[in-house]
Structures are given as C-alpha cells and as structure tokens.
Interface confidence: low
C-alpha cells in the first residue's frame, strides 16, 4: 500500500481542500473511525488499484486518524493497513469531542490507560489535572492520543490555552472495577418437573460488578418470552443472580436452558447450560440390574443395593416373602434409601450377621402416584462347610471303611486323600487321592441330602479300603464356595493289635 502524501502526520489549514491518494495491488478503501469515506476508486492499466479521498472545507473536527486498507481486509496482515494522522489547527475547536463512553474509563487491574483528550493543533501545550485541583500532573502527552499513565480512581480534566483563553476538556472518570474471569453457575430448583409444575432456574455470577445476562430457552424459540429477574445477593460480595421462572410448565418446555453472561469491560463471556425435562407424568425406572439369585454368607453382614431413577420422590418398601420389612429394633435389618442426585436413588437392605432364616424371596417396590417399579430376587444363605464326623470301622467282610459326614451351603464337594508314610505326611509328599481310581483298593459311596429347615446340604461319604497292610493316614476334605474343612483319621491294618 502507498499513501500520497506519505505522512505519517499532516498539518492542514482550516477551510482548505486536500487530496489523499492510496494505491495497492487490490481494491483499496479509505476509512475513518471504522467508517468508509466518500471517495473515488479506480483501476489502472497496470492492474494497480487506487482510491482518491478529497477533503473539502476542512475544520478542526477533521482532525484524527485516517486509514487506507484493502477493500476486503479481513485476515490481512497489519502492514496491509496504512495509518495517517491529520491535524487541522482550529481556534474555534478546543478539545475534540468524545463519545460518552470515552469519558468513563473502567479499570479491571492496575494497568496503563489513556485519557483521550486531543486538540486540533500539535503546537498547543496540554496539561492534565485532577478535576478538583490546579496542579498539573506529571503524565506524558501524545497529541494524537492523549495522556497515558497509571491513574487512580478519580476524575480528571485536560487544560490548554488557545490564544489568550484557557480551555478545559470534559471530565474523564476513572473507575477500578471488580472484574474477574467470569464464573457462571446455573442450577434449577428441579431439572425434572411434571406438566403444570413450575420451572425455576438461577444463574449466578461471582466476582463481577458489571454483567449482562441473556437466557436461551425452548419457549423463547417459539417467541414466548419470559422476563428474568436480576438481583444482588447482598450477603456475598459481587454475587449477581438472574432468576428465570416459568409457571405451569408444558411438555414443550423440555430442553436446554442456557444462561449467557457477558462482562462489557474486558469482553469476557461465559455460558452454562442445564437440561430441563418436563414429563407427562412421573416415572420410576430401574438403573442397572440385580441378579435373580443373590447370596449372603452365614453370620456375615450383607448389603443388597438397588439403583433407580424417579420423579417425583417415591416411597420405597422392601418385602420378604410378601411381608413388609422395617428397621428391626434388634439391629438385624437396616433399610435406607438415599437420594444420590436429583432423580437418582440408591435403596439398600442390610442384613446384619445373616441367619439361615433370612433366606427367601425379597422384593423392593418404589412407587408414587404416577408409576411404580418392583424388583425381586431370591436370597440364598451360604454356609461354610463343616466336617461333622470322620469315623473308621471294621465290618465283618474284612474290608475297612471310613465314613465322613459334613454340611454346608452350597453343596459341598468331598475329596478323599491318604498318606502311607506317616512320618513325612502330609507336608512333604502330596497325599494320593482316593475314590476316583479304578483300582480295587478302594471304593467310594456318597449320598447328598438337602435339609429344608436348615437350608443346607448334608454329604455322607463312605470310603471302603480293601487291603490295608500298614498304617494309613486318611483325610476327608469338604469344600464349597465359602470355605473348606478337613479331618484326618489313621487306619491301622487288621493284623496290628493297636490303633
């Protein structure tokens, strides 16, 4: 870009006419205060573009910045924009007029600012004063911009002398604002409501004095506006709140509610959204699953948990074998339903030191006036195995038998093992397993009975040993899902007189 004359600063006479030319490799345009000026644009044969700006009947108000830039200057580099400053000394114009917002300078931190009092003549001496004082402040002055420095929260004026008269500028007010990066929070009294209930949302900004709230909500899209209320939370410094209240919600009010907050000083903005659901009627819905068969271990505590979503808050009941359960005074059963989020609940049944009698069919029922859900499962009490009896006998047939009896829930497995070398058994040599060999040395017979009243299995296993020629250590091991137990007996050959 080439400007003629090149500037960067020109001093022109009042009432004169002046021509400025700008040329470049693409269409160019003259601008002042972000506005295009009336100008003549042309394209030369050598594919250069130019724009001629004719300033006529100049006055002091023509003092200021002029820019030449490419016509489509979006995204162009800074050096693809040329600046020119023109002074038109005019004794009838004191200080150049300011827009109202230029008279109020808002500070958000201790930083250098400019008080933009400008004159038409670069030769004039300009001084800065506090509004209520005569002493000139030691602040540097730039005729094109004004006074730049670090200023306190005060009122300031600029002074100059034109001819023999003293001229004062308008007063400039410097305010230091409480402004932080915007931190918006949005919450609702309820995010789920039924038709006809109220929707109330609050948008809170902390740490800012000057903010603007804008709400977006489903009703607004259909042109039905709701007037929010903005207030200050007086007990907290710089807490500003906007409340959006929609009485008697409709299904169409479901959707996203967004609070957009802008702070005009630093142009910061933040927005937060919240989803509101308006339901035709209330609901109860299970989340996740609970298996149809649950287990608890005898004499241990067991907590059974059901997670569900519901609105409005439901009543929760637990039943065992169709009998309503309640917290027992003996502390054997504890019931609790916790509201873990607005519409999410966790209901827990805790059985303390579980007893066999607590096995059975359990049901949780959650309900309110609109809906209900129920979940059922069977509770099985697991009992660790116990070996109740291990005995050895010598029937007349000549064989020797070892009988092992034990109980547990679920059904125990039985494992027989034996050691011939008593000195090294059972630590060093693995015992040989019995009862599953095809040899005729041993035979096994096992019977299982389920005892309904005790809700456990009894296993009776008889091991028949054919040829015992030296002492034999026989072990019976019972195992189930929750434990194992064992006993040993020494079987002595018939021929030996002792046991």
């Amino acid at each position: 870009l080439v400007i003629t004359p090149p500037g960067p600063e020109l001093i022109l006479n009042v009432s004169s006419t002046f021509v400025l030319t700008c040329s470049g490799s693409a269409p160019v345009v003259w601008e002042r205060m972000s506005q295009e000026l009336p100008q003549e644009m042309a394209k030369a044969q050598d594919n250069t573009f130019s724009s001629v700006l004719t300033l006529t009947n100049l006055t002091g108000l023509d003092t200021g910045e002029y820019f030449c830039t490419y016509n489509d200057s979006r995204g162009l580099e800074p050096d693809e924009r040329k600046r020119l400053y023109i002074f038109v000394p005019d004794p009838t114009v004191g200080f150049l007029p300011n827009d109202a917002e230029e008279l109020f300078i808002f500070l958000t931190e201790i930083t250098e600012i400019t008080i933009p009092c400008r004159v038409t003549d670069p030769q004039l001496v300009v001084t800065l004063h506090e509004k209520k004082g005569d002493i000139a402040l030691p602040v540097p002055y730039d005729h094109q911009r004004g006074f730049s420095g670090i200023f306190e929260d005060r009122s300031y004026i600029c002074k100059t002398t034109i001819g023999d008269r003293e001229v004062d500028s308008d007063a400039y007010y410097v305010y230091r604002l409480q402004v932080s990066s915007i931190n918006v929070s949005v919450n609702a009294v309820q995010t789920v409501v039924r038709q006809g209930e109220n929707i109330t949302l609050m948008c809170i900004v902390i740490g800012n004095e000057v903010v603007n709230f804008e709400w977006m909500y489903p009703r607004k899209e259909s042109g039905r506006l709701v007037e929010p209320v903005t207030d200050f939370l007086l007990d907290m410094p710089y807490h500003i709140r906007s409340i959006l209240h929609i009485p008697s919600a409709e299904l169409e009010d479901s959707g996203t509610y967004t609070c957009n907050v802008t702070e005009s000083v630093n142009d910061h903005q933040d927005e937060k959204a919240i989803n509101i659901t308006v339901v035709e009627s209330g609901y109860v819905r299970l989340l996740g699953e609970v298996g149809a068969l649950q287990f608890a271990e005898l004499h241990r505590s067991r907590t059974l948990q059901v997670v569900f979503e519901a609105y409005p808050p439901p009543t929760v009941l637990w039943f065992k074998d169709n009998r309503t359960l309640g917290d027992s005074s003996a502390g054997e059963i504890a019931l609790s339903t916790r509201n873990v989020s607005e519409t999410r609940y966790v209901s827990e049944l805790t059985l303390v030191r579980v007893k066999v009698a607590e096995a059975g069919h359990y049901t949780m029922r959650a309900f309110h006036e609109d809906a209900e859900v129920q979940l059922s499962f069977q509770l099985q009490i697991n009992v660790p195995v116990r070996v109740l009896e291990l005995s050895e006998s010598h029937p007349d047939s000549g064989e020797q038998t070892v009988r092992c009896r034990g109980r547990g829930m679920p059904q125990p497995n039985i494992i027989w093992s034996a050691c011939r070398d008593l000195k090294r058994c059972p630590r060093e040599l693995p015992p040989m397993l019995l009862g599953n060999s095809s040899e005729e040395e041993s035979q096994l017979e096992t019977n299982v009975t389920y005892w309904e009243e005790e809700q456990e299995f009894e296993v009776v296993s008889t091991l028949r040993l054919q040829h015992v020629d030296r002492p034999l250590s026989v072990r019976c091991t019972l195992r189930n899902a929750v434990g194992q137990d064992m006993q040993e007996v020494i079987v002595v050959p018939h021929s030996l007189p002792f046991k």
């Epitope: 959707g255 996203t256 509101i276 659901t277 339901v279 009627s281 819905r285 299970l286 609109d370 209900e372």
Partner: antibody, heavy 121, light 113 residues
C-alpha cells in the same frame, strides 16, 4: 425432524467383534428426555432388544447378551455405539437403533433404517 | 423375563375386512398404580424400520390411521385393523415395556386374501 442412521461393517468374521454406530440428527442425544437403544432382528425371526443407554452413560442390557455387549455414547458427535464381542453366525441380523422416552417406561417411537450385519468367514 | 406370544402366526384377510391379532404376556403388564398397560404394537414392512402404531395398549401414535385400534388389559391384548387396506400388508409385533429386558412377540404376518 429426528433421524437415526446406523453405520458399520456389513460383514464380520466369527469370534471377532461387531461394532456399529448410530448417528442422531435433528435432535440432541444429550436430551434428558430420552433413552437410546439397540434392537436386532435375525433373518426370518422376531425382534430382540439388546440394550439402552442414557446420555450420561447409564446403560442397561438384555441379560442374554450382557456378557458380550457394550453400549457407549459420544455426546460431542451426537452419536452412540454398540459393540458385540465373540460373534457367531447366530448374531447375523438387521440391527436397528431407536429412541424411547425416559418415563416410567415407554415404547420405541423413532427407529433408524437398520443395517444388515452378516457373520461369516 | 416376560415372554410374549402372538396368534395367529399369519392371517389372510380380504380388502376392507377386519383383521384381528392377539398377544399374550406371561405375566400381567398392568401397573395398578396408574392403571396403564405397558404394551405397544409395531408394524414392520420389508426394508423399513418398525413403525410404532399403538402404546399403552390402546393409545394410537400420532399420524396412525384410525382403522388401527388396540384393546385388552393385564395379560391379553388385541390389535384390530378395522378395514384392511393394501398398504397394511406387513408383520405386526407386540412389545412389553413393563420391565427389562423389553421383549417382543414373535410377530403375525398379515396378507390379502
């Protein structure tokens, strides 16, 4: 207008993993009013519900498939996905994604067009 | 799981005649607290996704012709097509949404006689 569109490979080898995506347009998957589900229909057979998902990540599955199924959501892309592991020829089916309301319970009111997945070597 | 059964497996009806499909659930899908039956009916045409016709056992989905109606309560339900049209040729499924897993009936094929 709400539209659901399933996408994924039409052919998967036995024992491999089947992955499908359902893209939701004309509405937000983050709506707190809906669940998003998968249903399948093997050739010549009836419909079978696989599982459903809430945008926050809550899932519930058909117990018959639970050990092999994962349903997940990507709210930034407005889509949700189905993964079915260790597939066999019995998993050959048209897979549909669908929407149902978050109420006490509700039917599937919007369905995708469906995509045929064949399990074969 | 709640098992849904349908009868008949297929039926052929003359144009303009009434078609009736039955659906039975293995347990009641009526919630006593709101007196609603958690049953839906869908229409499935080849190459198209299922289309919801009826929910709450008897409420017609918007846009569904009024020749389609649903009835029944508890465990026994019926879908009736009052006057069969050519475009009604399809397979019809009932579905319970009373509890998970949601289950569908095996379907009933409707043709023109």
């Amino acid at each position: 207008q709400l539209q659901l569109q399933e996408s994924g490979p039409g052919l998967v080898k036995p024992s491999e993993t089947l992955s499908l995506t359902c893209i939701v347009s004309g509405g937000s998957i983050s709506s707190s009013s809906y669940y998003w589900g998968w249903i399948r229909q093997p050739p010549g057979k009836g419909l079978e519900w696989i599982g459903s998902l809430y945008y926050s990540g809550i899932t519930f599955y058909n117990p018959s498939l639970k050990s092999r199924v994962t349903i997940s959501v990507d709210t930034s892309k407005n889509q949700f996905s189905l993964t079915l592991t260790s597939v066999t020829a019995a998993d050959t089916a048209v897979f549909y994604c669908a929407r149902h309301r978050v109420m006490a319970s509700s039917p599937f009111d919007h369905w995708g067009q469906g995509t045929l997945v064949t399990v074969s070597s | 799981d709640i098992v849904m059964t349908q009868s008949p497996e297929s039926l052929a009806v003359s144009l303009g005649e009434r078609a009736t499909i039955n659906c039975k659930s293995s347990q009641s899908i009526l919630y006593s607290s709101n007196n609603k039956n958690y049953l839906a009916w869908y229409q499935l045409k080849p190459g198209q996704p299922p289309n919801l016709l009826i929910y709450w056992a008897s409420t017609r989905e918007s846009g569904v012709p009024d020749r389609f109606s649903g009835s029944g309560s508890g465990t026994d339900f019926t879908l009736t097509i009052g006057s069969l049209q050519a475009e009604d040729v399809a397979v019809y499924y009932c579905q319970q949404y009373y509890s998970t897993p949601f289950t569908f009936g095996p379907g009933t094929k409707v043709d023109i006689k």
